[in-house]
C-alpha cells in the first residue's frame, strides 16, 4: 500500500513543498512520485520512504506517489492548492463630475486571484459597503448603480477584493483599487441672467452683470464673460447657491458696430450660455460754433450747430429745417445777448434707443460803458449829519470801473455809508471806463444845513 504526506497543501503561488512518499513493504521494487513540477529528492535511510521537494508551484496540482511491491502496484495523490491575490483591482474610469440625480454605474474589474472560491469583490463608498459578490469569470466584474446625490460630493468610491484563507489557517488578504472621488454638481437648465447696456458709446465704460441661481457647488462654477473677442475680467460674488459676476467693459472706435456679449457658466462637464447683442456706437457731442465767442454790440453773429451725420438737432429748442444734423441762426448782438446760452441738442437712434447729447456755448457781448439817470442820478440832496449811501451804477461788459471825483481830487465813496458833511457838497465828475471806452456824467451833491430858530 502507498501513502503520501501531506495529503492536502495550500501554498502561495511559486512556492515549494516537501512531499513524503511511503510504502508498506520493506523492499519495494519501485518507489517514486509523478509530477510535472520541478522536484528534488532528499536522501533518507531505508528503502520504504522518499522525500521530495517540489518547487515553483504555479497552479493547483495533484502529484502522485507510486510503489511496486511483491503483492502488487499502488498509488496515492496529494492535493496542492495554490493561492494568490488578484493582479489588478480597478474601478472602470468615470468622469469625476457627475450631475445630481444621475444613475452612476460603478464597475469593478478583477484580474487573477486564487482560489476563486475564497475570493470576494466588494464595492464601497467610503467605508460603506454597496455590494459584495464572489469573483466570477476572468476578469471578474462586479457592478452597482448609485443615484448621485448632493451629499455624495467629494465621496470616495473604491473596490476591494478579499481572499479569505482563514479556514485554511491562513489570513484574510485584501486588495483595494485606487479610489474614485466623485464630484457632484447641479447646473440648472435655465441659462444665466445677463444684464448689460443694449448700447454702449465708444470710449466709455459700461457694467455687465451675469448671475445664476440654483448652482452646486457654487464655488466651483467658472464664469466666462466676453464682448466679441474681448475677454472681460469679472468680480464674482458668491451666495449659498448663486453667483453674480460683475465686469467693466471699455469700448473703443475699433469695436464700433454690433458685438456679441456672452456669459458662459461651466460647472462639472456641463455649461450654460447666454448671448446678447450690444451695439457700440460713436456719437460725439454736437458742436456749437459762434462766428466769434466775444463780439461788440451790433455785430452780426452766426450760431451753427453741427452733429453726427445721422443725428437730428435742435438749436435753442428749434428743430433744424429740414430735420437733420445741422442748424443755424443769425442775430445782431445786443447787450441783452451778453451771457446768452446757445444750446444744441442732438438725438441719434441706436438700436432702437434714442441717445441725446447737448452742447452749450455762451456769447459774450461787449458794450458800454453806460451811465444813465436811472442808475446814476445827477442830483442828490441830503441833510447834513445824516447817513447816506451814494449810488451810481455803471453798466457795460466788461463791467466798467467807476470813479467820481470832485475837483479832480476828492472821491465820492460810491456804495459806502457816509456821514453827510459840508465837505461832501459839490459837483463830482463820474467817469466809467472799460476796454470798450469811457463815459462821464456830472453828479451834484447838495447838503441841507439844519435850521436854527
Amino acid at each position: 500500500q502507498t501513502s503520501v504526506s501531506p495529503s492536502k497543501v495550500i501554498l502561495p503561488r511559486g512556492g515549494s513543498v516537501l512531499v513524503t512518499c511511503s510504502t508498506s513493504c520493506d523492499q519495494p521494487k519501485l518507489l517514486g512520485i509523478e509530477t510535472p513540477l520541478p522536484k528534488k529528492e532528499l536522501l533518507l535511510p531505508g528503502n520504504n520512504r522518499k522525500v521530495y521537494e517540489l518547487s515553483n508551484v504555479q497552479e493547483d496540482s495533484q502529484p502522485m506517489c507510486y510503489s511496486n511491491c511483491p503483492d502488487g502496484q499502488s498509488t496515492a495523490k496529494t492535493f496542492l492548492t495554490v493561492y494568490w491575490t488578484p493582479e489588478r483591482v480597478e474601478l472602470a474610469p468615470l468622469p469625476s463630475w457627475q450631475p445630481v440625480g444621475k444613475n452612476l454605474t460603478l464597475r469593478c474589474q478583477v484580474e487573477g486571484g486564487a482560489p476563486r472560491a475564497n475570493l470576494t469583490v466588494v464595492l464601497l463608498r467610503g467605508e460603506k459597503e454597496l455590494k459584495r459578490e464572489p469573483a466570477v469569470g476572468e476578469p471578474a466584474e462586479v457592478t452597482t448603480t448609485v443615484l448621485v446625490r448632493r451629499d455624495h460630493h467629494g465621496a470616495n468610491f473604491s473596490c476591494r477584493t478579499e481572499l479569505d484563507l482563514r479556514p485554511q489557517g491562513l489570513e484574510l488578504f485584501e486588495n483595494t483599487s485606487a479610489p474614485y472621488q466623485l464630484q457632484t454638481f447641479v447646473l440648472p437648465a435655465t441659462p444665466p441672467q445677463l444684464v448689460s447696456p443694449r448700447v454702449l458709446e465708444v470710449d466709455t465704460q459700461g457694467t455687465v452683470v451675469c448671475s445664476l441661481d440654483g448652482l452646486f457647488p457654487v464655488s466651483e462654477a467658472q464664469v466666462h464673460l466676453a464682448l466679441g473677442d474681448q475677454r472681460l475680467n469679472p468680480t464674482v460674488t458668491y451666495g449659498n447657491d448663486s453667483f453674480s459676476a460683475k465686469a467693466s467693459v471699455s469700448v473703443t472706435a475699433e469695436d464700433e458696430g454690433t458685438q456679441r456679449l456672452t456669459c458662459a457658466v461651466i460647472l462639472g462637464n456641463q455649461s450654460q450660455e447666454t448671448l446678447q447683442t450690444v451695439t457700440i456706437y460713436s456719437f460725439p457731442a454736437p458742436n456749437v460754433i459762434l462766428t466769434k465767442p466775444e463780439v461788440s454790440e451790433g455785430t452780426e453773429v452766426t450760431v451753427k450747430c453741427e452733429a453726427h451725420p445721422r443725428a437730428k438737432v435742435t438749436l435753442n429748442g428749434v428743430p433744424a429745417q429740414p430735420l437733420g444734423p445741422r442748424a443755424q441762426l443769425l442775430l445782431k448782438a445786443t447787450p441783452e445777448d451778453n451771457g446768452r446760452s446757445f444750446s444744441c441738442s442732438a438725438t441719434l437712434e441706436v438700436a432702437g434707443q434714442l441717445i441725446h447729447k447737448n452742447q452749450t456755448r455762451e456769447l459774450r457781448v461787449l458794450y458800454g460803458p453806460r451811465l444813465d439817470e436811472r442808475d446814476c442820478p445827477g442830483n442828490w440832496t441830503w441833510p447834513e449829519n445824516s447817513q447816506q449811501t451814494p449810488m451810481c451804477q455803471a453798466w457795460g461788459n466788461p463791467l466798467p470801473e467807476l470813479k467820481c471825483l470832485k475837483d479832480g481830487t476828492f472821491p465820492l465813496p460810491i456804495g459806502e455809508s457816509v456821514t453827510v458833511t459840508r465837505d461832501l457838497e459839490g459837483t463830482y465828475l463820474c467817469r466809467a471806463r472799460s476796454t470798450q471806452g469811457e463815459v462821464t456824467r456830472k453828479v451834484t451833491v447838495n447838503v441841507l444845513s439844519p435850521r436854527y430858530e
Partner: antibody
Framework: SVEESGGGLVKPGGTLTLTCTVS????????MGWVRQAPGKGLEYIGI?????RTYYASWAKGRFTISKTSTTVDLKITSPTTEDTATYFC??????????????WGPGTLVTVSS | AYDMTQTPASVEVAVGGTVTIKCQAS??????LSWYQQKPGQRPKFLIY???KVASGVPSRFKGSGSGTEFTLTISAVQSDDAATYYC????????????FGGGTEVMVK
C-alpha cells in the same frame, strides 16, 4: 509824464519857486500835488491843486507854501525857507484820479538845500 | 484830520518768509488807500491802489487788504529784491490832513 525843476541851494529866509511840467494829460481834469522827503526821512504831503484851481494844504504847510498852475505847469512857492525845508521835492499827479496802473505819476524829484 | 499811522517802523525777514505791514487811518477813508515801495535814491514805486488792487507789473506776492481805518500790506515768499521802505497813503481827503502818508516801514531781508 511829470518833471520838476528849480531846485538847488537857497538861503534861509529867501524865496524859492519849484516848477512841475506835465505832458500827456490835462490839468483841467487832473489834480496835481507836491510831496517832499527830507534826507533819510519819510514822505511828507504838502498840498494839492484841484482841477478847478482850488488848493488844499497839509495843516503844517498852510501859509508857508503856495501852489499855483498854468495849462501845463504847476508851481510850488516856498516862502522863508528854513534848514528844515531841505528835502527832495516831488511833483505827483493826484493819487486817486485813475482807472489803471499807469497813473501815480511821480516826477524824479528836485533837491532843495536850505543853507546859509 | 485824516492822518496815517504805520507799524512797524522796521522789520527783518528771511528770504522766503512773509512780512505784514499795518496802516491805520485816524478816521474812515473807505478803500481809498495806496501802498508804495521806495529804494534809496529812487522815487517811490506804486504797488497797490484802492486798498487791494495790484498795479500792473507788480508781483502777486504783494497783497493789500482792509477798508475803513485798518489796512494791511502782506508780502509773501519774500525775495532779497523786496528790501525797501514801504509807505501807505490815504487818497480820500486832500484837506484837513496833517500827513497823507504813513511814517514808512523799512523791510530788511536776511
Amino acid at each position: 509824464s511829470v518833471e520838476e525843476s528849480g531846485g538847488g541851494l537857497v538861503k534861509p529866509g529867501g524865496t524859492l519857486t519849484l516848477t512841475c511840467t506835465v505832458s500827456g494829460f490835462s490839468l483841467s481834469t487832473h489834480a496835481m500835488g507836491w510831496v517832499r522827503q527830507a534826507p533819510g526821512k519819510g514822505l511828507e504831503y504838502i498840498g494839492i491843486i484841484g482841477s478847478s484851481d482850488r488848493t488844499y494844504y497839509a495843516s503844517w504847510a498852510k501859509g508857508r507854501f503856495t501852489i499855483s498852475k498854468t495849462s501845463t505847469t504847476v508851481d510850488l512857492k516856498i516862502t522863508s525857507p528854513t534848514t528844515e525845508d531841505t528835502a527832495t521835492y516831488f511833483c505827483v499827479r493826484d493819487p486817486y484820479d485813475s482807472f489803471d496802473d499807469g497813473y501815480r505819476l511821480w516826477g524824479p524829484g528836485t533837491l532843495v538845500t536850505v543853507s546859509s | 484830520a485824516y492822518d496815517m499811522t504805520q507799524t512797524p517802523a522796521s522789520v527783518e525777514v528771511a528770504v522766503g518768509g512773509t512780512v505784514t505791514i499795518k496802516c491805520q487811518a485816524s478816521q474812515s477813508i473807505y478803500s481809498y488807500l495806496s501802498w508804495y515801495q521806495q529804494k534809496p535814491g529812487q522815487r517811490p514805486k506804486f504797488l497797490i491802489y484802492d486798498a487791494s488792487k495790484v498795479a500792473s507789473g507788480v508781483p502777486s506776492r504783494f497783497k493789500g487788504s482792509g477798508s475803513g481805518t485798518e489796512f494791511t500790506l502782506t508780502i509773501s515768499a519774500v525775495q532779497s529784491d523786496d528790501a525797501a521802505t514801504y509807505y501807505c497813503q490815504q487818497a480820500y481827503s486832500s484837506s484837513n490832513v496833517d500827513n497823507a502818508f504813513g511814517g514808512g516801514t523799512e523791510v530788511m531781508v536776511k
